[in-house]
């Protein structure tokens, strides 16, 4: 679906998948419902979607965790959707923050995040988490995508 | 507002509607501030987005509700955006859960849903909710939309 | 990035700033990881976003906020995406309701607003929040922004 | 509490088959992720392969093509089928199932590749 070849559609949708690691960077698959427009958006090293050409892009991003306030530190849950562009240092887009539940063994809750940015070629968005073993990987629960204008 | 008579714009954004039923899917109406581009994009049934167009859209949901841990079952309140392709069975896009809250008589709560998917011709969207009697219907508090990129 | 001159890409996406007023009207700046398309979307007095062409705009807003049941009202937290045309009152597109966190001395938590609406030439849209008090400000917590379709 | 056992794993030589089983007591099948982790001596874990509810799987790129997860909801238990097995896939293979955000481990059942 072409907006003509010198402005082709860009978009990605990618979802989550465990990880035995123990990195804070959540990990994704191209697998279920995915979207993968073409190559100038890729999943690089099942961490960050990467893109080939400069622009706005509204990049989102969706956790579903489930946490329970006496097992976890005091500190809140927090989902960072992080930028790395080529030759600069990593910086924080969004984040969100949920205090943990105090359901048990563990209370659900779900964050949202999504802005407009420019993007350099060859930048790379990822998604950190304060504890990634809390995050819900059943069909939909935890999401990352991004669109170009 | 077109993008040229073979690229229109598709856009809705519908609002929610309090209903008898007892379906486990949300109701919506063409009501108070809603969008719908042309007829690229229907309301079907008062449930469900329909797309004339196959592509790439961001589809969206918003949902409030209003629950308690000690009146409600013990499973979170889910919400899902689902798929029904022609001729295909309805999928999972996305889900968002949240626990229950302690408050009295019950606490508020509200997720957000949003993705970028391909959609067939006579795709439809729609949004499955645990209990639809605990969905808010006050101004804006939920709604459910998408676009065409 | 232009599409074209009669269509140029029109997005912003500015960042929460703390104030002393004591307006429900929160208030943003053009700092950090901002974006700013061109003149046809422009910040007004720090707490709205204007624009210049009819059209449709997909906008949205993300406020984290900490509160406490105890120290709070019984009235959940509530944000508001409100629209100002020119001649017209004020409406609200979306809303979204938490009820306050039990965790002291108060529970973070995230909220996520956005739609698709059909704005007028001259029309604003500003976010509205029941306790700008309780509202977090560190690095991408609460943003608000625009782009037209 | 959510238990899982393991069963099928063997010593079986280059080539052959093998098909692990995962079964679950304590947990209905509702909203899950499950998924096959293996561990070789002195290698990190890593996962080989997953299934969610809705029936979305993802494979290592070692096994891709070899390698085929599955599960029967109604038995509540998960399955591994094993092909064309190499020397290199000996390892603990451990079952994980994450219910409603909630984790179980199983104890792990060996798989021995050698002729």
């Known amino acids: 679906m072409q907006k003509g070849d010198q402005n082709p559609q860009i978009a990605a949708h990618v979802i989550s998948e465990a990880s035995s690691k123990t990195t804070s960077v959540l990990q994704w698959a191209e697998k279920g419902y995915y979207t993968m427009s073409n190559n100038l958006v890729t999943l690089e090293n099942g961490k960050q979607l990467t893109v080939k050409r400069q622009g706005l892009y509204y990049i989102y991003a969706q956790v579903t965790f489930c946490s329970n306030r006496e097992a976890s530190s005091q500190a809140p849950f927090i989902a960072s959707l992080c930028l790395k562009s080529p030759g600069r240092f990593e910086r924080i887009l969004l984040r969100a923050a949920n205090t943990h539940s105090s359901a048990k063994p563990c209370g659900q809750q779900s964050i949202h995040l999504g802005g407009v940015f420019e993007l350099q070629p060859g930048a790379s968005v990822f998604v950190n988490v304060t504890d990634p073993s809390q995050v819900s990987h059943g069909t939909g629960f935890t999401s990352f995508g991004l669109l170009k204008l | 507002m077109q993008k040229g008579d073979q690229n229109p714009q598709i856009a809705a954004h519908v609002i929610s509607e309090a209903s008898s039923k007892t379906t486990s899917v949300l109701q919506w109406a063409e009501k108070g501030y809603y969008t719908m581009s042309n007829n690229l994009v229907t309301l079907e049934n008062g449930k469900q987005l329909t797309v004339k167009r196959q592509g790439l859209y961001y589809i969206y949901a918003q949902v409030t509700f209003c629950s308690n841990r000690e009146a409600s079952s013990q499973a979170p309140f889910i919400a899902s955006l689902c798929l029904k392709s022609p001729g295909r069975f309805e999928r999972i896009l996305l889900r968002a859960a949240n626990t229950h809250s302690s408050a009295k008589p019950c606490g508020q709560q509200s997720i957000h849903l949003g993705g970028v998917f391909e959609l067939q011709p006579g795709a439809s969207v729609f949004v499955n909710v645990t209990d639809p009697s605990q969905v808010s219907h006050g101004t804006g508090f939920t709604s459910f939309g998408l676009l065409k990129l | 990035m232009q599409k074209g001159d009669q269509n140029p890409q029109i997005a912003a996406h500015v960042i929460s700033e703390a104030s002393s007023k004591t307006t429900s009207v929160l208030q943003w700046a053009e700092k950090g990881y901002y974006t700013m398309s061109n003149n046809l979307v422009t910040l007004e007095n720090g707490k709205q976003l204007t624009v210049k062409r009819q059209g449709l705009y997909y906008i949205y807003a993300q406020v984290t906020f900490c509160s406490n049941r105890e120290a709070s009202s019984q009235a959940p937290f509530i944000a508001s995406l409100c629209l100002k045309s020119p001649g017209r009152f004020e409406r609200i597109l979306l809303r979204a309701a938490n009820t306050h966190s039990s965790a002291k001395p108060c529970g973070q938590q995230s909220i996520h607003l956005g739609g698709v609406f059909e704005l007028q030439p001259g029309a604003s849209v500003f976010v509205n929040v029941t306790d700008p008090s309780q509202v977090s400000h560190g690095t991408g917590f609460t943003s608000f922004g625009l782009l037209k379709l | 509490e959510v238990q899982l056992v393991e069963s099928g794993g063997g010593l079986v030589q280059p080539g052959g088959s093998l098909r692990l089983s995962c079964a679950a007591s304590g947990l209905t099948f509702s909203s899950y992720w499950m998924g096959w982790f293996r561990q070789a001596p002195g290698k990190e874990r890593e996962l080989v392969a997953s299934?969610?509810?809705?029936?979305?799987?993802n494979y290592a790129d070692s096994v891709k093509g070899r390698f085929t997860i599955s599960a029967d909801n109604s038995k509540n238990t998960a399955y591994l089928q094993m092909n064309s097995l190499k020397p290199e896939d000996t390892a603990v293979y451990y079952c994980?199932?994450?219910?409603?955000?909630?984790?179980?481990w199983g104890q792990g059942t060996l798989v021995t590749v050698s002729s």
């Open positions: 994980a199932v994450q219910v409603n955000g909630i984790w179980a």
């Open positions: 299934i969610t509810d809705g029936g979305s799987t």
